[in-house]
């Protein structure tokens, strides 16, 4: 297993609709034809997998059904979008990239993106 550098933004603020997007960029040492991207969430020293996708030549990442992630790829960049976030989902989201093929296998883990989610205030009743 060889190490690889992965860069991602330090902080992202989710939209009022609970959507957060960030770019995960990896320094590929060669021409990988099969890449696996995993998003991990670290909160209170616990790490859980949020979503994962293996992609090849296309520009759309396909995630498992009911995944909260969507994404596209372009060169060595992956544009990830996480949906359905609420305030309780605030945490550090880590991008893990694996170059699956051809050998050798490379693994890179980013420093994480702190995603802040603020639940929208309920609209006050309007008097007309």
């Amino acid at each position: 297993c060889k190490a690889m550098h992965v860069a991602q933004p330090a902080v992202v603020l989710a939209s009022s609709r609970g959507i957060a997007s960030f770019v995960c960029e990896y320094a590929s040492p060669g021409k990988a034809t099969e890449v696996r991207v995993t998003v991990l969430r670290q909160a209170d020293s616990q790490v859980t997998e949020v979503c994962a996708a293996t992609y090849m030549m296309g520009n759309e990442l396909t995630f498992l059904d009911d995944s909260i992630c969507t994404g596209t790829s372009s060169g060595n960049q992956v544009n990830l979008t996480i949906q359905g976030l609420r305030a309780m989902d605030t945490g550090l989201y880590i991008c893990k990239v694996e170059l699956m093929y051809p050998p050798p296998y490379y693994l890179g883990i980013g420093n994480g993106t702190q995603i802040y989610v603020i639940d929208p205030e309920p609209c006050p009743d309007s008097d007309f």
Epitope: T33, E34, R36, T54, Y55, M56, M57, G58, N59, E60, T62, F63, L64, D65, D66, S67, T70, T72, M100, Y101, P102
Partner: antibody
Amino acid sequence: QVHLVQSGAEVKKPGASVKVSCKASGYTFTSYWINWVKQAPGQGLEWMGRIAPGSGTTYYNEMFTGRVTMTRDTSTSTAYMELSSLRSEDTAVYYCARGDYFDYWDQGTMVTVSS
Amino acid sequence: DIQLTQSPSFLSASVGDRVTITCSASKSVSYIHWYQQKPGKAPKLLIYDTSTLASGVPSRFSGSGSGPEYTLTISSLQPEDFATYYCQQRTTYPLTFGGGTKLEIK
């Protein structure tokens, strides 16, 4: 010139298994998914699953999980789809298609399940 | 699973007509891809990533849409366009196809 060539038509009895091959040429076999698609007579298209020929990573449609196995032989640039416990509803044309965009297809393999 | 509903299922039109086929997803998808299939033949990729024409596909075909609603338009029908058309999504597994739209000569 990209080509996908599948094995010939098969007639099987219920409960048996069938293994269909898809030989690729004209491109780097390990750079594109191989997808398998089922089309029953007079029906639409149903994605069965896919295999990444380099690593062998597979994704299956749960409708076929437990009955379908996708493998590949990189030395011959050939992908295989094996379907077990065949029943009459499995009578269909099975296609292999290349890549994320399903940009190349073979003409398909007709599998008939009949007692 | 993401369901794709195509409408209409059947469409009768004449050469020269402009026709539009709709593909509606049960939840938002990133892109839609379109295929054409003629009887006894394998499907053929027409449009990928919602609006990009596949190699060799005539410019009378176009695709558009976003979120859950997508369309395929043929600006001026030619005799060779009478076929069945399928949309497909690959935002999530399992990849799914629409039920198809059969385009027939009026």
